[in-house]
C-alpha cells in the first residue's frame, strides 16, 4: 500500500522519493506523475528528470527541491488545493528491462486546521507535523521531521478534514509553519 | 491527423517468418511510445510489445519473447515487428497503437494467419 | 497476470436508455484502467483512461468511475452508433490485460 503524507490547502507538499546514484554523480531519469505507477513510465506526468536535470514540468507548481544530483528527488507541490489530492508516482528509471522502481505515495490535502479551544493559533501541516502516515500491514515508516518540530497531539480523522490541536508546547522553530492568531 | 496505417500480414506457415510495418503520420513519431496490440479470432485483445522511444527499451509478452522483434526507423516513422518461428497461435489481427499503458489511437490492423 | 472479468457478456438496450458496463480486476489496479470501443471490422478507439478521464474526442454521455478492482463505463443516453463491443484493461500490472468485452446490442 502506499504511503500517505497530508497537507494543508495554500500550503505546500512534499512527497518523499530517492535513491542512490551509483556510482555517486550516475544520475538516472526520473519522472513524477499524478495516479499510481502504471506498467510503463509515468501516467499524467507532473515532473520529468533527465540524467542532468529537471526537463519537463507541468506546471511552475511543481519543484524537486532536495540534493538533486545526490538522488533526492522529493517532488514538491507548491500551495496546494483539494484538487491535488491522490497517489503520486515516483519512478526512478533505472537503466535495463524492468529495472525501474517505482513508488506510490498518496497525498491527503486537508482544508485549514480548525484549532480549539479559543484563542488559537492556526497552522500549516506541510512541513510543521511529521507528515506520515501509513497504510497497509508493514506498521508505520520512518516519520519525516524537518526541522524541529512542536510537541502536538493530533488526531486526523480518515472521513473529516479537520485537524485537532490539544496541546502545543514548543515554539514552531525552523518548520515552516505560519502562525496566525485567531 | 493522427493516423497508424499497418502492413506486411498474410498466410504463413509454422516455423515461418513475416515482418509487419505500421506507418504512423501526424504527430512527432520520435517521442512517442509504440506498441503493438493482437486479438485471435474470439478472443480478448492481448497486448504484445512496446517500444520506449528515444530510450530503445523494449518490452514483450512472454509468449513472443525471443520470437518477435519490435523496432522503429524514425527517418520513416515507421513501427515494425519481426515474427519469427511463428505459431498458429500467433495467428490474431495486429494493430499498432501509440501510447505506452493506454494506446490511442489504433491502426487498422492487418491479419496474419499462421496454417499448413 | 491480473484477470480483467467484464460483466455482462451481451447487453440488449435501446436508444435513448442508460447503459451500465462492469469491470472486475482480480488484484487492485488503482486507477490504471482504460475503456475501448470496437465496431465491427474497426480498430478499437479509446474512450476513457486512468479509470475517470474521457479521451480526446469522446461525447460527454460516456463516462468512467470506480478504483481498485470494480470500474464502470456508463453510457447515459445510448445513441445508435453506441452499439458495438467494450473492453476494459489494467495498466497497472505487467502485462498489461484485457477484460474479454461486453456486447452492447439493439434490443
Known amino acids: 500500500s502506499e504511503v500517505e503524507y497530508i497537507a494543508e490547502v495554500g500550503q505546500n507538499a512534499y512527497l518523499p522519493c530517492s535513491y542512490t546514484p551509483a556510482p555517486p554523480g550516475n544520475l538516472v531519469p526520473v519522472c513524477w506523475g499524478k495516479g499510481a505507477c502504471p506498467v510503463f513510465d509515468c501516467s499524467n506526468v507532473v515532473l520529468r528528470t533527465d540524467n542532468r536535470d529537471v526537463n519537463d514540468r507541468t506546471s511552475g507548481r511543481y519543484w524537486l527541491k532536495g540534493d538533486f544530483h545526490k538522488g533526492d528527488v522529493s517532488l514538491t507541490i507548491e500551495n496546494v488545493t483539494l484538487a491535488d489530492s491522490g497517489v503520486y508516482c515516483c519512478r526512478i528509471q533505472i537503466p535495463g528491462i524492468m529495472n525501474d522502481e517505482k513508488h506510490n505515495v498518496k497525498l491527503v490535502v486537508i482544508k485549514p486546521a480548525k484549532v480549539t479551544p479559543a484563542p488559537t493559533l492556526q497552522r500549516d501541516l506541510t512541513s510543521a507535523f511529521p507528515r506520515m502516515l501509513t497504510t497497509g500491514e508493514h506498521g508505520p515508516a520512518e516519520t519525516q521531521t524537518p526541522g524541529s518540530l512542536p510537541d502536538v497531539n493530533l488526531t486526523v480523522s480518515n472521513f473529516f478534514c479537520e485537524l485537532q490541536i490539544f496541546t502545543l508546547t514548543n515554539e514552531l522553530r525552523d518548520s515552516g509553519a505560519t502562525i496566525r492568531t485567531a | 491527423e493522427v493516423q497508424l496505417v499497418e502492413s506486411g500480414g498474410g498466410l504463413v506457415q509454422p516455423g515461418g517468418s513475416l515482418r509487419l510495418s505500421c506507418a504512423a503520420s501526424?504527430?512527432?513519431?520520435?517521442?512517442?511510445?509504440m506498441t503493438w496490440v493482437r486479438q485471435a479470432p474470439g478472443k480478448r485483445l492481448e497486448w504484445v510489445a512496446n517500444?520506449?522511444?528515444?530510450?530503445?527499451?523494449?518490452y514483450y509478452v512472454d509468449s513472443v519473447k525471443g520470437r518477435f522483434t519490435i523496432s522503429t526507423d524514425n527517418a520513416k516513422n515507421s513501427l515494425y515487428l519481426q515474427m519469427n518461428s511463428l505459431r498458429a497461435e500467433d495467428t490474431a489481427v495486429y494493430y499498432c497503437?501509440?501510447?505506452?499503458?493506454?494506446?490511442?489511437?489504433w491502426g487498422q490492423g492487418t491479419l496474419v494467419t499462421v496454417s499448413s | 497476470e491480473i484477470v480483467m472479468t467484464q460483466s455482462p457478456a451481451t447487453l440488449s438496450m435501446s436508444p435513448g436508455e442508460r447503459a451500465t458496463l462492469s469491470c472486475r480486476a482480480s488484484?487492485?489496479?488503482?486507477?490504471?484502467l482504460a475503456w475501448y470501443q470496437q465496431k465491427p471490422g474497426q480498430a478499437p478507439r479509446l474512450l476513457i483512461y486512468?479509470?475517470?478521464t474521457r479521451a480526446t474526442g469522446i461525447p460527454a454521455r460516456f463516462s468512467g468511475s470506480g478504483s481498485g478492482t470494480e470500474f464502470t463505463l456508463t453510457i447515459s443516453s445510448l445513441q445508435s452508433e453506441d452499439f458495438a463491443l467494450y473492453y476494459c484493461?489494467?495498466?497497472?500490472?505487467?502485462?498489461?490485460?484485457f477484460g474479454q468485452g461486453t456486447r452492447l446490442e439493439i434490443k
Open positions: 486512468g479509470a475517470s
Open positions: 484493461q489494467q495498466y497497472t500490472h505487467w502485462p498489461i490485460t
Open positions: 501526424g504527430f512527432t513519431f520520435s517521442t512517442y511510445w
Open positions: 517500444i520506449k522511444q528515444g530510450g530503445g527499451d523494449k
Open positions: 497503437a501509440r501510447g505506452s499503458n493506454w494506446f490511442d489511437p
Open positions: 488484484q487492485s489496479v488503482y486507477d490504471n
